[in-house]
């Protein structure tokens, strides 16, 4: 007899040969799987799965919980299924009350029916409350009711599956929907301080705050240009439903100079990433750097005001500041303040206010500042510009007329002869001798100049003018003399101020 070549393997047959079967509660379920290569029966409902290696599945007294899909599988991996409803008027719904939905995705409210012939299978709000207007759902008696495109606003929504059984509305146990938000923006990251300055051995601690809609945001501290895993500690809070905050604190208990660098707090979610950086500078010891805000050599006119201003960087923070002049410390007339209120600030300003300076108040003004590690100072050389003052004007025994003037800058002395009684002297007279008397004396204050002319050069009655001047102003002194015969009888010196 010719051999028959076997065809393609076929799926098993099930008796009764139906896709669905309705059994009353308490009655028997008897399912037969017909296949020469029978392997097993599998029962599935909600998250429950049972297996049976017998080719006949028998449940003597059916319960509502026996409602579900029965699948017979053969050795070829082919299968056939039948769905059995166990109708129980006291238990219309099978429920798995866990209900999670991802925002913008569909989610299944698992409340399959035990009776496919009920009507108005739908969702209802708890306590009769209306469901959200935009909530759409699709019922499936074998699986439950699918909520379409879950919204964030549905979080904590209380609902029931509902169906009309013999003209009466029946509700399932209640479900509370928990919505997992979708990431629709990158995380928000911020850092406690943008920069840190420490001395060796001090503790470095910096906190990154990460804000997002859920705790599944990822975050880490990274060292730029380094793969080393950093030690960090976390604290986190939920401020309401979709407002999560995490604080990631990075600590280096004893910072070293080579720990200096840029540290990045990085966070990402499925939408994207964000980062923020902080800079650490570790120095072996503290420092002070002073920057004058005006020239350290200052020229000021007599009677005017001047402000000596410095900015300085000090780390650690300054402990002592003072302004000194002629070994005397100013107790007032100065102020010292931080350049900014930022807690990272290391820059400060100090101002000394000198008012109505006198010619005698020129000199070196010194600002001194110190912290726990170093001292620093800066000096200002203050020159007070003064109008010349004629100190002496005499006729010497040797016939010389001598004028001595003091002022700053160094005065120039010019001589003029005025014939007769005029006091407008135009004819200049060259001095015989000019000396700066205190050029080698103290570096500040007035400079004294002495100038002499020979009076024997004058043959007529008249007045001699000694005029001392500099950039600030001028002052004159006059010598009146007359001839009696061939003798110069008298010389009356007097001054005339010329502004």
């Amino acid at each position: 007899q010719p051999s028959v070549s076997p065809g393609e393997p076929s799926p098993p047959s099930i008796h009764p040969a139906k896709s669905e079967l309705i059994v009353r509660v308490g009655n028997e379920i008897r399912l037969l799987c017909i296949d020469p290569g029978f392997v097993k029966w599998t029962f599935e409902i909600l998250d429950e799965t049972n297996e049976n290696k017998q080719n006949e599945w028998i449940t003597e007294k059916a319960e509502a919980t026996n409602t579900g899909k029965y699948t017979c599988t053969n050795k070829h991996g082919l299968s056939s299924s039948i769905y059995v409803f166990v109708r129980d008027p006291a238990k219309l719904f099978l429920v798995d009350r866990s209900l999670y939905g991802k925002e913008d995705n569909d989610t299944l409210v698992r409340c399959p029916l035990t009776d496919p012939e009920v009507t108005s299978y739908s969702l209802k709000g708890c306590q009769g409350k209306p469901l959200p207007k935009d909530l759409r759902f699709v019922p499936d008696p074998k699986a439950g009711i699918t909520i379409k495109s879950v919204k964030r606003a549905y979080h904590r929504l209380c609902l029931h599956c509902s169906a009309d059984q013999e003209g009466k509305s029946v509700l399932s146990d209640k479900f509370i929907l928990k919505v997992r938000p979708a990431f629709k923006a990158v995380p928000v990251v911020s850092v406690s301080k943008a920069s840190y300055l420490l001395r060796e051995g001090e503790e470095f601690t910096v906190t990154c705050t990460i804000k997002d809609v859920s705790s599944s945001v990822y975050s880490t501290w990274k060292r730029e240009n380094s793969q080393t895993k950093l030690q960090e500690k976390y604290n986190s809070w939920h401020h309401g439903d979709f407002n999560y905050e995490r604080q990631a604190t990075l600590t280096i208990s004893s910072a070293r100079v080579n720990d200096s660098g840029v540290f990045m707090c990085y966070a990402n979610n499925t939408f994207g990433s964000a980062n923020v950086t902080t800079t650490l500078e570790v120095v072996d010891k503290g420092f002070i750097n002073i920057f004058p805000m005006i020239n350290t050599t200052v020229f000021v006119n007599d009677g005017e005001n001047v402000d000596l201003i410095v900015e300085y960087e000090a780390f650690p923070k300054p402990e002592h500041q003072q302004w000194i002049y002629m070994n005397r410390t100013f107790t007032d007339k100065w102020e010292d303040y931080p350049k900014s209120e930022n807690e990272s600030n290391i820059r400060y300003v100090s101002e000394l206010h000198l008012t109505r300076l006198k010619g005698t108040e020129g000199g070196t003004y010194t600002f001194l500042v110190s912290n726990s590690d170093v001292n620093a100072s800066i000096a200002f050389n203050v020159y007070v510009n003064t109008k010349p003052e004629i100190l002496t004007y005499d006729r010497l025994v040797n016939g010389m007329l001598q004028c001595v003037a003091a002022g700053f800058p160094e005065p120039t002395i010019d001589w003029y002869f005025c014939p007769g009684t005029e006091q407008r002297c135009s004819a200049s007279v060259l001095p015989v001798d000019v000396q700066t008397l205190n050029a080698s004396g103290p570096p500040f204050g007035k400079l004294v100049v002495q100038s002499s002319i020979d009076s024997s050069a004058f043959k007529h009655n008249g007045t001699v003018e000694c005029k001392a001047y500099n950039d600030v102003g001028k002052t004159s002194a006059y010598f009146n003399f007359a001839f009696k015969g061939n003798n110069k009888e008298q010389i009356h010196p007097h001054t005339l101020f010329t502004p």
Partner: antibody
Framework: QIQLVQSGPELKKPGESVKISCKAS????????IHWVKQAPGQGLRWMAW????????TYADDFKGRFVFSLEASASTAHLQISNLKNEDTATFFC?????????WGQGTLVTVSS | SYELIQPPSASVTLENTVSITCSGD??????AHWYQQKPDKTILEVIY???ERPSGISDRFSGSSSGTTAILTIRDAQAEDEADYYC???????????FGGGTKLTVL
């Protein structure tokens, strides 16, 4: 069928208290909230409060906090509204309502008259 | 405070169609429900969830919603439709109910 049946009319003096009731039948009492609604003579409907029949927790409208107590007697499928220190302006018909969509079914109303 | 605005009165000749409006800022995302109060004070729900009709309510009653306005339409108006009609919706995250001011419908 679902029914909400309210207690009868009340005549009270200012300063007194009144307690009116709303008995539900035809459904599982704890499935649906009970709402209370006030209608003053010649006026429209004003929602006062709803009470969660599962937990007993009331949720009030701002104007009905203080003198108004909303309570349940779940074993008797009954909700109560008590008003203390009655005022002339409390004269009104009070309705209870409930059902599968909040105000699906209404009681017949209870007239409370406050008069000295 | 939140309000639902209804016209105080409306009229319709017998067997004609009338529409009553209810306006409120939240109505684009909250359902409107409609209630009929007869002269004897009895109250009946005629429309829920914008457009659903409870069993036992005549199909002459219909509801719709567009933007911030909900509409109750009564076609083929009958003498027994003469009543006050109230819309109701909810407001705030707590879904607190609020009624419109009511519309007195006269059937001529």
């Amino acid at each position: 069928q679902i029914q909400l049946v309210q207690s009868g009319p009340e005549l009270k003096k200012p300063g007194e208290s009144v307690k009116i009731s709303c008995k539900a039948s035809g459904y599982t009492f704890t499935d649906y909230a009970i709402h209370w609604v006030k209608q003053a003579p010649g006026q429209g409907l004003r929602w006062m409060a709803w009470i969660n029949t599962e937990t007993g927790k009331p949720t009030y409208a701002d104007d009905f906090k203080g003198r108004f107590v909303f309570s349940l007697e779940a074993s008797a499928s009954t909700a109560h509204l008590q008003i203390s220190n009655l005022k002339n302006e409390d004269t009104a018909t009070f309705f209870c309502a409930g059902g599968s969509h909040w105000f699906a079914y209404w009681g017949q109303g209870t007239l409370v008259t406050v008069s000295s | 405070s939140y309000e639902l605005i209804q016209p105080p009165s409306a009229s319709v000749t017998l067997e004609n169609t009338v529409s009553i409006t209810c306006s409120g800022d939240e109505l684009s995302n909250k359902y409107a429900h409609w209630y009929q109060q007869k002269p004897d004070k009895t109250i009946l729900e005629v429309i829920y969830n914008d457009s659903e009709r409870p069993s036992g309510i005549s199909d002459r009653f219909s509801g719709s919603s567009s933007g911030t306005t909900a509409i109750l339409t009564i076609r083929d108006a009958q003498a027994e439709d003469e009543a006050d009609y109230y819309c109701l919706s909810t407001f705030s995250d707590d879904d607190l109910p609020i009624f419109g001011g009511g519309t007195k419908l006269t059937v001529l």
